[in-house]
């Protein structure tokens, strides 16, 4: 029980300094201080996707 409680402790009790190095399909989310799955940005004029080009997000459909 104790070990489990440590593993799921509140996010605010953990160090929030340097962003973690994430793998290629992930990026660092400052809100949760961890790597999460990330989608690619999409440049509207070219239609290309890139993790470096900000623009309208490429999504299969609208949000609910």
């Amino acid at each position: 029980m104790g070990a489990r409680r440590l593993r799921v402790r509140s996010q605010r009790s953990r160090d929030s300094s340097v962003p973690t190095q994430c793998n290629q399909t992930e990026c660092f989310d400052p809100l949760v201080r961890n790597c999460v799955s990330c989608e690619l940005f999409h440049t509207p004029d070219t239609g290309h996707t890139s993790s470096l080009e900000p623009g309208t997000a490429l999504q299969p459909q609208e949000g609910s």
């Epitope: 593993r7 799921v8 402790r9 509140s10 996010q11 605010r12 953990r14 929030s16 962003p19 994430c22 990026c27 660092f28 989310d29 400052p30 809100l31 949760v32 201080r33 961890n34 999460v36 799955s37 990330c38 989608e39 690619l40 940005f41 993790s51 470096l52 900000p54 997000a57 999504q59 949000g63 609910s64």
Partner: antibody
Amino acid sequence: EVQLVESGGGLVQPGGSLRLSCAASGFTISASSIHWVRQAPGKGLEWVAWVLPSVGFTDYADSVKGRFTISADTSKNTAYLQMNSLRAEDTAVYYCARRVCYNRLGVCAGGMDYWGQGTLVTVSS
Amino acid sequence: DIQMTQSPSSLSASVGDRVTITCRASQDVSTAVAWYQQKPGKAPKLLIYSASFLYSGVPSRFSGSGSGTDFTLTISSLQPEDFATYYCQQSQISPPTFGQGTKVEIK
């Protein structure tokens, strides 16, 4: 199609407990953070808690800390909000939502893109 | 916790008007601000993320700007379906916090 469906709301007496469920389809919850947000009648949005199922990290609003517990079962693709010691001021529509992230130079640029329909929790004697 | 202060709390406008809603964070949140639209009895909808990026399917009359502590949502030409309540939210530091909302009503 991405979808979030909440269930488990209802009428409960002060001091009572409820467990809300948020069943996800069309995506895997382990890849994102899942949030509970509530809205009291006629009031604004109040964030309640989040869970990052891949690692089990959690955080809570001060107003619910010690009373509510957020969790997730990745095998069922479902998130939960266990609510204990309920108070009249917990009366609200409870929504679950997914936080989407877009990769902007290795950092998340995102927001809550998919929301459930909401489930009403009424705490009254 | 970071406070998000929205203004005005409500406004009356006509179809075709340009509408501006502001949100001020109590500390620097970089560009980690999203804007949502909510209609009565419905779940919120994401409009803008990362302060200025338009979410998929959202009409281009919506735009966002700002960084640090001051943020703006602009509707360039208000349409009948835009009468709703709008919320800002910061997600730079947990806990994520919402503004109190701005209700846009028909004049």
